[in-house]
Amino acid sequence: NQDLPVIKCVLINHKNNDSSVGKSSSYPMVSESPEDLGCALRPQSAGTVYEAATVEVDVSASITLQVLVDTPGNISCLWVFKHSSLNCQPHFDVQNRGVVSMVILKMTETQAGEYLLFIQSEATNYTILFTVSIRNTLLFTLRRPYFRKMENQDALVCISESVPEPIVEWVLCDSQGESCKEESPAVVKKEEKVLHELFGTDIRCCARNELGRECTRLFTIDLNQTPQTTLPQLFLKVGEPLWIRCKAVHVNHGFGLTWELENKALEEGSYFEMSTYSTNRTMIRILFAFVSSVARNDTGYYTCSSSKHPSQSALVTIVEKGFINATNSSEDYEIDQYEEFCFSVRFKAYPQIRCTWTFSRKSFPCEQKGLDDGYSVSKFCNHKHQPGEYIFHAENGDAQFTKMFTLNIRRKPQVLAEASASQASCSSDGYPLPSWTWKKCSDKSPNCTEDIPEGVWNRKANRKVFGQWVSSSTLNMSEAMKGFLVKCCAYNSLGTSCETILLNSPGPFPFIQDSIS
């Protein structure tokens, strides 16, 4: 055993930015730190065979399988994958270990399987076996967390039925509004399923796994807060649990809270109360209304009343199926080149949506913000003044919604010209879409002021590049015009731009560009 080399097998995961086939080399990529694969001598095998722990990667992932060999002298090697030999270039690192790598770029089904590395050193021969498989992420789910009361305790349990099992955390905040943003110092996170401290201002539970993060806020009516101008509304689907918390603070304990649904007191077992003294000796009471599995008849106005505070209500609406309500008519905007502008979509949805903004086949992250009227808004400002078509897409498992926006940037035309044997052509992408004039330059008209009235064909907006319209104008050449200079000019309300073309030239041959504002 002492004669055998010390072998270390590692996996390096790369951030994808290129695609290619497996390469047995080092390759410049942004990489995560190497992960040990626990290479060990395979028991009862003929010959010296080391085996690495099975590697499971996502489709399209880029990885490097790497072997580090502590062995004196030179080594030679050969990779074998599905009976094909792949060349192998060992090198030595700073610790003088032999390093052999196999890069797999953009993992596909065909690249999954057993990779065998045969190494020959001056002392011995041995084989290293890597098994690479593709992770079945189709079975992964991430469900929004929900609350349950803990048996025989005044505590809430947060549950998220997700695969892989998620990490569940409570996100607590005792401030109001903006200061309760996720990374604010006012926010406290507790990585546990059970929460006993239920008196806080803002209570959320979040679940996260490989698919991301989903949160649920504990719906709260605070009798010490001024009621919203619009009645708070809570949507739930049939079968989901309902939890509403009513909270009130008073100078002493001489007050009580009650819940009513449509002016009828809630049944015993549908609520529970907790109370505590705050640091300034005032009494805080909270009263939870809960239904473990809602039905259509749980819809209605839930009112929390106090003997010492004005009552407040919330409208609970039970739906059969989730929804996304918003106007899907497309919207067109035109802005100046340096004008600040954001696209905006206002919607009401349940369950909460996942959304993306897309431009030019590129997706951008989508943020959404709840408004006081029960609606939410998503804004997109990162358009960098690029004209074209922008798409907002939202889905929540039950419903899908798509809205199209067109952004036009007001600017002076810029002309591109080209000539062939039979015609001259000019195109421009300015906005508003330009109009065209063609002028002939001759001895009689050295300033190119002679109009060309015939043979001009204008095509407005013939080419749509990601929603960006382009206008073009073509001049069909007559024999009489050959050898002449002509000028095409595009103009709109912001200015004019011209190109001069020598007719009879075989390729793109603009040689003077005028800009007339």
């Epitope: 996996l11 040990d36 626990g38 085996e51 098994t131």
Partner: antibody, heavy 124, light 107 residues
Framework: QVTLKESGPTLVKPTETLTLTCTFS??????????VSWIRQPPGKCLEWLAH???????SYSTSLKSRLTISKDTSKSQVVLTLTNMDPVDTATYFC????????????????WGQGTMVTVSS | DIQMTQSPSSLSASVGDRVTITCRAS??????LAWYQQKPGKAPKRLIY???SLQSGVPSRFSGSGSGTEFTLTISSLQPEDFATYYC?????????FGCGTKLEIK
């Protein structure tokens, strides 16, 4: 270099819940099929296996302690967490976490690397 | 659950001695057995896996044998650093189970 390090309270009161964290580096439970187990050893006594979590999130627990144990992992933080409820003085022990690679040909090398252990005392 | 019975529970020996420790499984575990060495205040260290495969970096005086239900760990010539407690572990099926250890002391 592969390391595992246990952390958590050194003193716990009876009936309380113990939460221990195993933070590891040099390997991951995201891409390689690996598992992490918790093992404990009361002073001067035998090693006792408690729970195991696989990279695919499957779990296995000691028969005698199943009702009190929960094991979970946070792949992004390279952590495995063990909770043991309703602690009793007999749960006083050094708690270890250890890694177990899984090989495609079906054999296993058991625990190849261990953490240094953390001593937990249960006392009122 | 599979029970692992380790014997002897303690053993006195001298440097240079040949020592054998036995582990018996209550049912067939094929060769899914590992041997660990533990020194006071330290974590266990793997010596043997898959019943007979020597851990990389472990001296060749350590060897393992057996299959099914009977397993042995042999130290061919004891060295001063070998005085420690040795444990067997079956990892054939969950729950995993350890033997209760053999304490190897200097005679």
């Amino acid at each position: 270099q592969v390391t595992l390090k246990e952390s958590g309270p050194t003193l716990v009161k009876p009936t309380e819940t113990l939460t221990l964290t195993c933070t590891f580096s040099g390997f991951s439970l995201r891409y390689a099929r690996m598992g992490v187990s918790w093992i404990r050893q009361p002073p001067g006594k035998c090693l006792e296996w408690l729970a195991h979590i696989f990279s695919n999130d499957e779990k296995s627990y000691s028969t005698s302690l199943k009702s009190r144990l929960t094991i979970s992992k946070d792949t992004s933080k390279s952590q495995v967490v063990l909770t043991l409820t309703n602690m009793d003085p007999v749960d006083t022990a050094t708690y270890f976490c250890a890694r177990m690679p899984e090989y495609s040909s079906g054999w296993s090398g058991a625990f190849d690397i261990w953490g240094q252990g953390t001593m937990v005392t249960v006392s009122s | 659950d599979i029970q692992m019975t380790q014997s002897p529970s303690s053993l006195s020996a001298s440097v240079g001695d040949r020592v054998t420790i036995t582990c018996r499984a209550s049912q067939d575990i094929r060769n899914d057995l590992a041997w660990y060495q533990q020194k006071p205040g330290k974590a266990p260290k793997r010596l043997i896996y898959a019943a007979s495969s020597l851990q990389s970096g472990v001296p060749s005086r350590f060897s393992g044998s057996g299959s099914g239900t009977e397993f042995t760990l042999t130290i061919s010539s004891l060295q001063p650093e070998d005085f420690a407690t040795y444990y067997c572990l079956q990892h054939n099926s969950y729950p995993l189970t350890f033997g209760c250890g053999t304490k190897l002391e200097i005679k």
